[in-house]
């Protein structure tokens, strides 16, 4: 009957024996033998291996392509890939930040509920009754209509979701 060999979590089975895996930041150059330990080599500059591995090549660090609006957020190391993010005014369109999109401004009649971040777009909401927004903006919220009453004035023109109330002097009673 064939023997069942179980290796530890940082080992692998090769030719019937347990060999040590290469450490993160390195790659395999030769499997272990009865006399020799697993031989590994450190990843070269611009390369990485993030896991315990038995791979003969390290992975290339990611390039953050400026033409796609990307920039380096965190430089890669021998054990980790480069992390990209988007330039100012843009946000990532996927979890891995493979591309960027311009932040969307909230149009008149809509206010900013949540400002855009490097990973999320602006969240807009329609201005409710009593509030307005008269411009396209990445950060302006809906503002309350002016209270003509508080200023001892009367409403000359009603407000909308896009315009403020226009107040004027109360007409004298004759």
């Amino acid at each position: 009957l064939g023997q069942c060999v179980t290796c530890s979590d940082k080992q692998y089975l090769h030719d019937g024996q347990c060999c040590d895996l290469c450490q993160p930041g390195s790659r395999l150059t030769s499997h272990c033998t009865a006399l020799e330990k697993t031989q590994c080599h450190p990843c070269d500059s611009g390369e990485f291996s993030a896991q315990w591995n038995r791979e003969i090549r390290c992975h290339q660090h990611r390039h953050c392509e400026p033409n796609q609006g990307l920039r380096v957020k965190k430089e890669g190391t021998a054990e980790s890939d480069t992390v990209c993010t988007c330039k100012e005014g843009q946000h990532c369109t996927s979890k891995d930040c493979e591309a960027c999109a311009q932040h969307t401004p909230c149009i008149p009649g809509f206010g900013v509920m949540e400002m855009a971040t490097e990973t999320t777009d602006t969240v807009c909401h329609p201005c409710p009754v009593g509030f307005f927004s008269n411009q396209s903006s990445l950060f302006e919220k809906c503002y309350p209509w002016t209270s003509c009453e508080d200023k001892n004035l009367e409403v000359l023109q009603k407000g909308t979701s896009q315009t403020n109330v226009i107040c004027g002097l109360k007409s004298r009673m004759r």
């Epitope: 040590d20 895996l21 450490q23 590994c40 021998a78």
Partner: nanobody, 125 residues
Framework: QVQLVESGGGLVQPGGSLRLSCAAS????????MGWFRQAPGKEREFVAA????????YYADSTKGRFTISRDSARNTVYLQMNSLKPEDTAVYYC??????????????????WGQGTQVTVSS
């Protein structure tokens, strides 16, 4: 042939600090994965801390986590072990070790193929 020389040991009061150094010479690479181990009289050699060749990853024994910090200066080919909040149970001979084949679990003594002579650390009032 890699040579490792430890220094910085000594007598310190409980709650005190020490910084151990391990200077490496004679290797193919400027940096190897390095580990610190310790051995108290009558006890097994015990893992303390380790650092990857690039310095990007560090590993600690549960007993030293939060108190000890391993670091490296690749330009000087030196690995350091900053030991704070020392306790009497930290008393031991401290050894540094190098792994020239870049494989194996950091916490296993068998992973390392070169060892220093050791430096004595005594924590006592």
């Amino acid at each position: 042939q890699v040579q490792l020389v430890e220094s910085g040991g000594g007598l310190v009061q409980p709650g005190g600090s020490l910084r151990l150094s391990c200077a490496a010479s004679g290797g193919t690479f400027s940096s190897y994965p390095m580990g610190w181990f310790r051995q108290a009289p009558g006890k097994e050699r015990e893992f303390v801390a380790a650092i990857s060749w690039s310095g990007g990853s560090t590993y600690y024994a549960d007993s030293t986590k939060g108190r000890f910090t391993i670091s490296r200066d690749s330009a000087r080919n030196t690995v350091y072990l900053q030991m704070n909040s020392l306790k009497p149970e930290d008393t031991a001979v401290y050894y540094c070790a190098a792994n020239t084949h870049f494989s194996g679990a950091f916490e296993h003594a068998r992973t390392y193929d070169y060892w220093g002579q050791g430096t004595q650390v005594t924590v006592s009032s």
